[in-house]
């Protein structure tokens, strides 16, 4: 099938980084500056993305791949391919329509992005709070209250605090 197709369509022989130039008898011509083709057999090259304004270049455009952008410091990427930059907040805060606001009591955010999430409820796992939560950190759950009864000869070392799940980005 491939051989048949190439007999019918000479453009299928043009590799990535080139385009099939109709103005030159369908010769494979290199993509012009600031353009690329990531697949073979293309009749045009795509214009390279320009990382301007709040965006900065993470990866330069080449003849075979588009530029990749990220955000200037103080911002992080949102959307497919970093289509938008969202302002960072401090740990212990979340971004609202009115800007960065501190997490309400009983919630925390250990990142510069995302939302404040409730502290872990240790009692649901039959455990006690070993370290109190803050705006920036989840509580650390320790042994169950029964394990801490006066008759117990030794305290079992607490299990490591579970890594809080990342909030959906």
């Amino acid at each position: 099938f491939e051989r048949t197709r190439s007999l019918q369509d000479p453009c299928s022989n043009c590799p990535a980084g080139t385009f099939c130039d109709n103005n030159r008898n369908q010769i494979c011509s290199p993509c012009p500056p600031n353009s690329f083709s990531s697949a073979g057999g293309q009749r045009t090259c795509d214009i390279c993305r320009q990382c301007k304004g709040v965006f900065r270049t993470r990866k330069e455009c080449s003849s075979t791949s588009n530029a990749e952008c990220d955000c200037t410091p103080g911002f992080h990427c949102l959307g497919a391919g970093c289509s938008m930059c969202e302002q960072d907040c401090k740990q212990g805060q979340e971004l609202t329509k009115k800007g960065c606001k501190d997490c309400c009591f009983g919630t925390f955010n250990d990142q510069k992005r995302g939302i404040c999430r409730p502290w872990t409820n240790c009692s649901l796992d039959g455990k006690s709070v070993l370290v109190n939560g803050t705006k920036e950190r989840d509580v650390v759950c320790g042994p169950s209250p029964a394990d801490l009864s006066p008759g117990a000869s030794s305290v079992t070392p607490p299990a490591p605090a579970r890594e809080p799940g990342h909030s959906p980005q």
Partner: nanobody
Framework: QVQLQESGGGLVQPGGSLRLSCAAS????????IGWFRQAPGKEREWVSC????????YYADSVKGRFTISRDNAKNLVYLRMNSLKPEDTAVYYC???????????????WGQGTQVTVSS
């Protein structure tokens, strides 16, 4: 043609003041948040301040809080950045931008000006 144009930059001594203006042509600033960014030589672009369209709420970077004031005059289609108590580290090219959403989100299709140079030196 839609564009933003900054003006009011210049050379000023430390402790001095400047007022930058951001003028829009081809569209009305009323419906846009307007942000100011700056870029010093060899450094990354830095967010400075922003004013919302809806209620004119103002937001500032910690580095300029208490020294800079952003305001808008919708009748004149202008946004101002008043800069007091200027320091040498405020030296940069200052850009205004009109994000399509709000003060906290900036996209590829936002309008940007060409920038105005502010130099703070004795």
């Amino acid at each position: 043609q839609v564009q933003l144009q900054e003006s009011g930059g210049g050379l000023v001594q430390p402790g001095g003041s400047l007022r930058l203006s951001c003028a829009a042509s081809g569209f009305s600033l009323d419906y846009y948040a307007i942000g100011w960014f700056r870029q010093a030589p060899g450094k990354e672009r830095e967010w400075v301040s922003c004013i919302m369209s809806s209620d004119s709420s103002a937001y500032y970077a910690d580095s300029v809080k208490g020294r800079f004031t952003i305001s808008r005059d919708n009748a004149k289609n202008l946004v101002y950045l008043r800069m007091n108590s200027l320091k040498p580290e405020d030296t940069a090219v200052y850009y205004c931008t009109a994000p399509r959403s709000d003060c906290f989100h900036y996209g590829e299709n936002d309008y940007w000006g060409q920038g105005t140079q502010v130099t703070v030196s004795s």
